[in-house]
Amino acid sequence: CDLPQTHSLGNRRALILLAQMGRISPFSCLKDRHDFGFPQEEFDGNQFQKAQAISVLHEMIQQTFNLFSTKDSSATWEQSLLEKFSTELNQQLNDMEACVIQEVGVEETPLMNVDSILAVKKYFQRITLYLTEKKYSPCAWEVVRAEIMRSFSLSKIFQERLRRKE
């Protein structure tokens, strides 16, 4: 399973689409910046087996997909870009699921790292809470878009490390 290679390309395409999705100038949104507490430590460790690492990445992509699939998201972003972005994420999720199934027979370790997946879930809960508190304002969405771009970039480094380990 050559997930890191294919996923890295998908990640890059998703990042490009996210970059294109901006609707307002972010310069007007400085005061809306927020600390979402990206769970960096979950993407730092080398303790993961490949299946566990993929499950954490899967959770991040799944949560991102969920976030951008809401009706509030549809009301904010340009529809064709949003659809392309969702399609890209969906493809990545399918690739990951296939990859994890392949890895099951290879590894003895548990398939999921429960604590890491919970940390990612809580991170996205903080993002959703922020959007709710900000009443899904255009600036709040801009801040979230910037945060997701950053988390994708950080997870890309994690994937590259994973590829070097193979």
Partner: antibody, heavy 121, light 107 residues
Framework: EVQLVQSGAEVKKPGESLKISCKGS????????IGWVRQMPGKGLEWMGI????????AYSPSFQGQVTISADKSISTAYLQWSSLKASDTAMYYC??????????????WGQGTLVTVSS | DIQMTQSPSSLSASVGDRVTITCRAS??????LNWYQQKPGKAPKLLIY???SLQSGVPSRFSGSGSGTDFTLTISSLQPEDFATYYC?????????FGQGTKVEIK
């Protein structure tokens, strides 16, 4: 290693044009904004403006709006500050600095070494 | 524009002294406040961001506090390399604005 490297010192005459540069390396250039800061001899720091290299969107301080132009070429990871007609009062040290945009991260965490611009007849 | 006012404009202190510099914003800036150190002929260096977060690599003798309109930079025990000019800067809105600077000199 993150670095912002600025072009060398310039000596110009009033009325001349000038474009100075700031080249970023060691990080994703389009993931951060680039700000420009002026420091006149013996004075404090003044924010001039900023650019988002990903789409070249700019914002200027009212004090500098129309006086300078900020641009960027993301293909070579370089931001620019330019004047179409220099004045003696433009004599100063100019710094570029990296800004995290809307991310919760340190503002202006890396700075260029500065470009000294001297305008004299 | 948000005005940033630092005090004092300059101070004299000895090695080992505790030094406090204050910065006041003309309106609330929450915790969007940074502190920089600048030595002659050098670029500014970020010390503190978001009012109280210590920038990576900066000695722990530097600390920041405050929120709203009033902020403080403290150097718990002044070292020879700390003699410099210090600037506060608000980052809540454009135009970004700096304080006029506080020069810390040797007594």
């Amino acid at each position: 290693e993150v670095q912002l490297v600025q072009s060398g010192a310039e000596v110009k005459k009033p009325g001349e044009s000038l474009k100075i540069s700031c080249k970023g390396s060691g990080y994703s250039f389009t993931s951060y904004w680039i700000g420009w800061v002026r420091q006149m001899p013996g004075k404090g720091l003044e924010w001039m403006g900023i650019i988002d290299p990903s789409d070249s969107d700019t914002a200027y301080s009212p004090s500098f709006q129309g006086q300078v132009t900020i641009s960027a070429d993301k293909s070579i990871s370089t931001a620019y500050l330019q004047w179409s007609s220099l004045k003696a009062s433009d004599t100063a040290m100019y710094y570029c600095a990296r800004h995290p945009g809307l991310n919760w991260a340190p503002d202006f965490d890396y700075w260029g070494q500065g470009t000294l611009v001297t305008v004299s007849s | 524009d948000i005005q940033m006012t630092q005090s004092p404009s300059s101070l004299s202190a000895s090695v080992g002294d505790r030094v406090t510099i204050t910065c006041r914003a003309s309106q609330s800036i929450a915790e969007f406040l940074n502190w920089y150190q600048q030595k002659p002929g050098k670029a500014p260096k970020l010390l503190i961001y978001f009012a109280s977060s210590l920038q990576s690599g900066v000695p722990s003798r530097f600390s920041g506090s405050g929120s709203g309109t009033d902020f403080t930079l403290t150097i718990s025990s002044l070292q020879p390399e700390d003699f410099a000019t210090y600037y506060c800067q608000q980052s809540i809105d454009f135009p970004l604005t700096f304080g006029q600077g506080t020069k810390v000199e040797i007594k």
